[in-house]
């Protein structure tokens, strides 16, 4: 019994004066608590407690269920205890079958003994099934069997407490161990879409999926730089023992421009936290923005190909696209496709393929696109470079020689005189008059140039060459002269193609 120095309050004393007492079933339990300031007796076993205000605790016919800790407490709050075992060969265990264990922690299988002198107090698997090889325990006849460092693999383990009695194993009722997993990684979070683009008044709904080993993972939707509580709905599932999934859906039924921003789905457990964001952009109305992928002024050589390419952003989705030339709509030769297959894609590409362009096919090519909110267009000015063509070459009544040529870019006309029968005309002749004429064709067609020289300057037989050229090529026409006496005659003019 405890002893203390005089003057100080001392704990009560109990008779019999031992820490443990073993009685047989049916025998009397008589416990006396001696203390001037006696308050109460308390009996505890498993989750059961009883109180008695008399200083003597008497149980006339002890039962196995009277096994437990008897504590006497005085008015100073000091106490003393005795543990009583009521030995009952028919009931060796007291049992509380609830059994939960946290992974990596110890857990108590609550099967205290009614007889501390039995041997081989241990655990056995149900129906002869083996227990995990790495399972270890600490036996305590007053509390039960503590399983050390519970593993996830022990989940749903069926077991019995076991003792040997007269050479035979006696098993308790069965226990099923339920393991609460420890968090050994941060939650896995993902979002249904990384970005949303909406018009005012449309519904914004986004779902965050949180995956973890148990439902005690915490999660919430937050608006960045805001403390406002967001309205969210949850659905959850257990896919097997340690595979929990929660879907947290955030909804704004009628989005406004000022709802635009970054929304974060945040989750944490005892190991750490994880988050994922989605961006919401709310526009007051839809839009289309067109970006030419080549210069809108295009120069192409006669007979060559060119692709007119645009990229455009359209929200909502484009409904009508067309390419137009000279008020005519192309039915083929073009393609239109999304820039990516992503569900939230708003960028598209349109390509018009012009093949073997002729000089007459220069002009304005227009791409038009529309959606339910807006229309947009972009124009390409296409110039077809053509080799000069000599349209007319004449001797006029006033004695002038005139050469008219057409091409793009604007041709230059040079004049040369070749004396006698020489083929090489090297002596250049200055023109009297050069004019650029207005073409009757489209504004992107060939440019027409007229050049004249005075033929009276020529005193000998020979050939006059009119040469028209530009960046693409050159063409010549020739005038032949012969003198009969004092008369000058024009012999047939002719052209000679010079590549």
């Amino acid at each position: 019994q405890p002893s203390v120095s005089p003057g100080e309050p001392s704990p009560p004393s109990i008779h019999p004066g031992k820490s443990d007492l073993i009685v047989r079933v049916g025998d009397e339990i008589r416990l006396l608590c001696t203390d001037p300031g006696f308050v109460k007796w308390t009996f505890e076993i498993l989750d059961e407690t009883n109180e008695n205000k008399q200083n003597e605790w008497i149980t006339e016919k002890a039962e196995a269920t009277n096994t437990g800790k008897y504590t006497c407490t005085n008015k100073h709050g000091l106490s003393n205890s005795i543990y009583v075992f009521v030995r009952d060969p028919a009931k060796l265990f007291l049992v509380d079958r609830s059994l939960y264990g946290k992974e990596d922690n110890d857990t108590l299988v609550r099967c205290p003994l009614t007889d501390p002198e039995v041997t081989n107090y241990s655990l056995k698997g149900c129906q002869g099934k083996p227990l995990p090889k790495d399972l270890r325990f600490i036996p305590d006849p007053k509390a039960g069997i503590m399983i050390k460092s519970v593993k996830r693999a022990y989940h749903r383990l069926c077991l019995h407490c076991s003792v040997d009695q007269e050479g035979k194993s006696v098993l308790s009722e069965k226990f099923i161990l339920k393991v609460r997993p420890a968090f050994k990684a941060v939650p896995v979070v993902s979002v249904s879409k990384a970005s949303y683009l909406l018009r005012e008044g449309e519904e914004f709904t986004v779902t965050c999926t949180i995956k973890d080993v148990s439902s005690s993972v915490y999660s919430t939707w937050k608006r960045e730089n805001s403390q406002t509580k967001l309205q969210e709905k949850y659905n959850s599932w257990h896919h097997g023992d340690f595979n929990y999934e929660r879907q947290a859906t955030l909804t704004i039924s009628s989005a406004r421009v000022n709802d635009s921003g970054v929304f974060m789905c945040y989750a944490n457990n005892t190991f750490g936290s994880a988050n994922v964001t989605t961006t919401l952009e709310v526009v007051d109305k839809g839009f289309i923005n067109i970006f030419p992928m080549i210069n809108t002024t295009v120069f192409v050589n006669d007979g060559e190909n060119v692709d007119l390419i645009v990229e455009y952003e359209a929200f909502p989705k484009p409904e009508h696209q067309q390419w137009i030339y000279m008020n005519r709509t192309f039915t083929d030769k073009w393609e239109d496709y999304p820039k990516s297959e992503n569900e939230s894609n708003i960028r598209y590409v349109s390509e018009l393929h012009l093949t073997r362009l002729k000089g007459t096919e220069g002009g304005t090519y227009t791409f038009l696109v529309s959606n339910s909110d807006v229309n947009a267009a972009i124009a390409f000015n296409v110039y077809v470079n053509t080799k000069p063509e000599i349209l007319t070459y004449d001797r006029l009544v006033n004695g002038m020689l005139q050469c008219v040529a057409a091409g793009f870019p604007e041709p230059t006309i040079d004049w040369y005189f070749c004396p006698g029968t020489e083929q090489r005309c090297s002596a250049s002749v200055l023109p009297v008059d050069v004019q650029t004429l207005n073409s009757s064709g489209p504004p992107f067609g060939k440019l027409v140039v007229q050049s004249s020289i005075d033929s009276s300057a020529f005193k000998h037989n020979g050939t006059v060459e009119c040469k028209a050229y530009n960046d693409v090529g050159k063409t010549s026409a020739y005038f032949n002269f012969a003198f009969k006496g004092n008369n000058k005659e024009q012999i047939h003019p002719h052209t000679l193609f010079t590549p």
Partner: nanobody
Amino acid sequence: EVQLVESGGGLVQAGGSLRLSCAASGRTSGSYVMGWFRQAPGKEREFVAAISWSAGMTYYADSVKGRFTISRDNAKNTVYLQMNSLKPEDTAVYYCAADQRGVPAYYSDYALYDYWGQGTQVTVSS
């Protein structure tokens, strides 16, 4: 680290008694289990008895139940094996074993104990 030293072995007549001691040096804790195993020539090491350090709960092989008693003295960090009614088939080297992680579910499996003594010879003559 834990060191285990056995003593008390010897030669005894059948029906006689011996008391083996196993002194543990190093830290012992509430999770401790200490046990006795034996190995006869040409045979596998077999479980004899074990005791949990905290509550003193005892475990015995069927072959020794009622004849052998295992006990502990916490103050001396020592475990005892009192062997009565000895038989010639009890002849073997007796080893003391210990583990700090608790009683193995298969406490009779010698592979589940971390620490071992050098052994002491017990010979029972007929």
